[in-house]
């Protein structure tokens, strides 16, 4: 099974002297998830032609994947660390239902999909500890998530493949933006 960052003593310098919310730990954790996404994307692209498809917009309209916007304060222009940290946590919480959807979408990378899901949960906990303005963080309604999951799983095969591809691509972009922003916090 994939090892989470910090589980291996070689992985983190002086692991016991670092708070869980330290910049380095959070950075390592995000990079670990990004590595997992790369592995999942590889399997997705190998088994279907979704990665070259021009019909992404069709499927994207039916998904409400979290995305960074100027107003979120996570870009260099108009950077706002409090607003941005809330957006990162809220976005990760919103991605959880999509990561749940991915769990049955992989054959050879089943463990990797589980690792991405579990380490995202841990990352959310790390970031919640770091955030002071927790009141502004809205958690998605469990009932809304359940019905979304049912809807996604009821799609035809082509749409399911496209949805998988779009989730991975969007999650990768979201994490990369988060990584850049967290560096200045």
């Amino acid at each position: 099974a994939p090892v989470l960052p910090g589980e291996d003593s070689k992985d983190v310098a002086a692991p016991h002297s670092q708070p869980l919310t330290s910049s380095e730990r959070i950075d390592k954790h995000i990079r670990y998830i990004l590595d997992g996404i790369s592995a999942l994307r590889k399997e997705t692209c190998n088994r279907s032609n979704m990665c070259e498809s021009s019909k992404e917009a069709l499927a994207e309209n039916n998904l409400n994947l979290p995305k960074m916007a100027e107003k979120d304060g996570c870009f260099q222009s108009g950077f706002n660390e409090d607003t941005c940290l809330v957006k990162i946590i809220t976005g990760l919480l919103e991605f959880e239902v999509y990561l749940e959807y991915l769990q049955n979408r992989f054959e050879s990378s089943e463990e990797q999909a589980r690792a991405v899901q579990m380490s995202t949960k841990v990352l959310i906990q790390f970031l919640q500890k770091k955030a002071k303005n927790l009141d502004a963080i809205t958690t998605p309604e469990p009932t809304t998530n359940a019905s979304l999951l049912t809807k996604l799983q009821a799609q035809n095969q082509w749409l399911q493949d496209m949805t998988t591809h779009l989730i991975l691509r969007s999650f990768k972009e979201f994490l990369q933006s988060s990584l850049r922003a967290l560096r200045q916090m």
Partner: antibody, heavy 118, light 109 residues
């Protein structure tokens, strides 16, 4: 062009205080975490402190913790370092620098000399 | 406390290639340590060469390159020139702080 200009250094007695300033221009100051780094005569650089872009988080090296306070005023594009209970070993050139990120590297000022001596 | 280690001194012939390394007393250097490299000549402020492992600072000649090799960060100078004779310092983010190495004195002869 990125410019960082430190000021406020000088000669101070042990136990005294000093406030350093760093005026920044040529980049979006409020989007970058900022640091103070010092270099004692004949020694290598030593990281002193960092403040996040919005000023909400501050970090300190063990040797200055509890004595130095980093702060910033984004409306004035200025970084500060309040140094209290100064010791002889704090004698150094103090540099301010932005934290590399957003696709850009870190820039350093030319430094201001702080001498702690009786 | 984790110590950042560098070779105390190194020499290279003009036109030659040299690789300086930057390690940790405990653990491996990773991209999350954001290795940075600085050059300092006598009487001058340190000058940033490389940031975030392998990004060259603006205005830095392309003979300077950064990488992570094995468990260390590395600075490679390909085709060393006389003006490259200087002290080289690496810096690593460790936890929430930044630590500098003791520096490598590079001689070009």
């Amino acid at each position: 062009e990125v410019q960082l200009l430190e000021s406020g250094g000088g000669l101070v007695q042990p136990g005294g205080s000093l406030r350093l300033s760093c005026a920044a221009s040529g980049f979006t100051f409020s989007s970058y975490a900022m640091s103070w780094v010092r270099q004692a005569p004949g020694k290598g650089p030593e990281w002193v402190s960092r403040i996040s872009a919005g000023g909400g988080s501050t970090y300190y090296g063990d040797s200055v913790k509890g004595r130095f306070t980093i702060s910033r005023d984004n409306s004035k594009n200025t970084l500060y370092l309040q140094m209290n209970s100064l010791r002889a070993e704090d004698t150094a050139v103090y540099y301010c620098a932005n934290r590399a990120g957003w696709g850009a590297g870190d820039y350093w000022g030319q430094g201001t000399l702080v001498t702690v001596s009786s | 406390q984790t110590v950042v280690t560098q070779e105390p001194s190194f020499s290279v012939s003009p036109g030659g290639t040299v690789t300086l390394t930057c390690g940790l007393s405990s653990g491996s250097v990773t991209a999350s340590n954001y290795p940075g490299w600085y050059q300092q000549t006598p009487g001058q402020a340190p000058r940033a060469l490389i940031y975030s492992t392998n990004d060259r600072h603006s205005g830095v000649p392309d003979r300077f390159s950064g990488s992570i090799s094995g468990n260390k960060a590395a600075l490679t100078i390909t085709g060393a020139q006389a003006e490259d004779e200087a002290d080289y310092y690496c810096a690593l983010d460790i936890g929430d702080i930044t630590e500098f190495g003791g520096g490598t004195q590079l001689t070009v002869l």
